[in-house]
């Protein structure tokens, strides 16, 4: 039950995270005009990964796409790439995790296959989240660098007479959306990986010994939760010595690579 809950919650958290990463990638407000300590402008400039916009005081908003590819800064291209990779990995992860959900039955899919798929999707979500966090952080670092550079020469004088006000940009809403979304996707991925451990059928290498007291047979089965869950299963008993001590091995034990995650 706990495994199903963990897996389901991981899926939902990752779904919200990936939706947030997509939203952040599409948003125009990655960087917004810094209004603090600046001349009060009748326009508000803001920029996204794909276009820059200007909102005039009348409310009229005009956006222009970056129609060049080669002319864009390498950092912006890198951020775009990271966000797209994050979205693609996240989307594939979602697709895989749907089939891996314990509550969904697809034919006679074994638990080991579901565990495999859960782990795969979990890793994809973790990488997706890291890509988004990295992309947003690279952009934020770029903004901070440019902010202090433009603060250093806020007014670039031309012959001491005419001044050009340099527009400074600060963090836009998309950065915060991206950070939160990336974090959620990461958390969701970790939850999927945790759920995978619970889903994986374990090979029981425990030897359970039965001690026969005089008159009745009382069995003691060491080995923790996993070994004791098969109390209704078929067991084969091997006689070791006449004193009545017997070893019990579970019949339904499959070796699994997830035993020691």
């Amino acid at each position: 039950m706990a495994v199903t809950a963990c897996q389901g919650l991981g899926f939902v958290v990752s779904l919200i995270g990936i939706a947030g990463i997509i939203a952040a990638t599409c948003m125009d407000q990655w960087s917004t005009q810094d209004l603090y300590n600046n001349p009060v402008t009748a326009v508000f400039n803001y920029q996204g990964l794909w276009r820059s916009c200007v909102r005039e005081s009348s409310g009229f908003t005009e956006c222009r796409g970056y129609f060049t590819l080669l002319g864009l800064p390498a950092m912006l291209q890198a951020v775009r790439a990271l966000m797209i990779v994050g979205i693609v990995l996240g989307a594939i992860g979602l697709l895989v995790s749907i089939f891996a959900l314990k509550c969904i039955r697809i034919g006679s899919m074994e638990d080991s296959a579901k565990a495999n798929m859960t782990l795969t999707s979990g890793i994809m979500f973790i990488v997706s989240g890291l890509c988004a966090i990295a992309g947003v952080s690279v952009f934020a670092n770029m903004l901070v660098t440019n902010f202090w550079m433009s603060t250093a020469n806020m007014y670039t004088g031309m012959g001491g007479m005419v001044q050009t006000v340099q527009t400074r940009y600060t963090f836009g809403a998309a950065l915060f959306v991206g950070w939160v979304a990336g974090g959620l996707t990461l958390i969701g991925g970790v939850m999927m990986c945790i759920a995978c451990r619970g889903l994986a059928p374990e090979e029981t290498n425990y030897k359970a010994v039965s001690y026969h007291a005089s008159g009745h047979s009382v069995a003691y089965k060491p080995g923790g939760f996993k070994a004791s869950t098969g109390f209704g299963s078929n067991t084969k008993n091997k006689k070791i010595y006449d004193g009545g001590a017997r070893t019990e091995d579970e019949v339904q034990s499959y070796p699994s690579k997830h035993d020691y995650v």
Partner: antibody
């Protein structure tokens, strides 16, 4: 047809107060920012204040801040300019003007103006 | 505040001749975000309110005759009346539309020679 009609001007003593009104018609008033601009007799134009469609933000020319207050009532399609502690140099024709949409913040329609005379 | 300096203060031009008015701003009116200039030109005839002629430094307002044209970028702008008509006698103002307060130039009075 867009129409802006100012009213409330007149003769007022120095230190006195006056409230100007601007009645708007012919357009969706609640969707547009509005300006007040004044013009002293025989002089040039001087921008006074701006109020956005939703009453925030509001901007004033520095020298009039604290004495002049701009407000609007979208339900009544009306713009107001409350003027206090009036001085002789506030004597001017006061115009209300609409902040045009998609005209790079220019003032696309103006009223005929109302004359305010501050004199003892 | 942005200072808008217009020149000349007055201009006398023969009918059908070209009239040119200059406007200089103390700071660039070119917005980097959209590479547009935020400068407007107004015409004010005696006893009338101002009328918008040009916005964005070079775009004519609808209904304005094509003899009026605006040019320039950054800090230097020009209003040109290609062939002066009698009805063009007025005072012309430039205005900064990028920074608050939205300052006006001192005005240029255009008369018939």
């Amino acid at each position: 047809e867009v129409q802006l009609v100012e009213s409330g001007g007149g003769l007022v003593q120095p230190g006195g107060s006056l409230r100007l009104s601007c009645a708007a018609s012919g357009f969706t008033f609640s969707s547009f920012g509005m300006h007040w601009v004044r013009q002293a007799p025989g002089k040039g134009l001087e921008w006074v204040a701006y109020i956005s469609s939703g009453s925030s933000p509001i901007y004033y020319v520095d020298k009039l801040k604290g004495r002049f207050t701009v407000s609007r009532d979208n339900a009544k399609n009306s713009l107001y300019l409350q003027m206090t502690s009036l001085r002789a140099e506030d004597t001017a024709v006061y115009y209300c003007a609409r902040a045009g949409y998609a005209v790079r913040n220019a003032l696309d329609y103006w009223g005929q103006g109302t004359l305010v005379t501050v004199s003892s | 505040d942005i200072v808008m300096t217009q020149s000349p203060d007055s201009l006398a031009v023969s009918l059908g001749e070209r009239a040119t008015i200059n406007c200089k701003s103390s700071q660039s009116l070119l917005n980097v975000g959209n590479q547009k200039n935020y400068l407007a030109w107004y015409q004010q005839k005696p006893g009338q309110p101002p009328k918008l002629l040009i916005y964005g430094a070079s775009t004519r307002e609808s209904g304005v005759p094509d003899r009026f044209s605006g040019s320039g970028s950054g800090t230097d702008f020009t209003l040109t009346i290609s062939s002066l008509q009698a009805e063009d006698v007025a005072v012309y103002y430039c205005q900064n539309d990028l920074f608050y307060p939205l300052t006006f130039g001192g005005g240029t009075k255009v008369e018939i020679k």
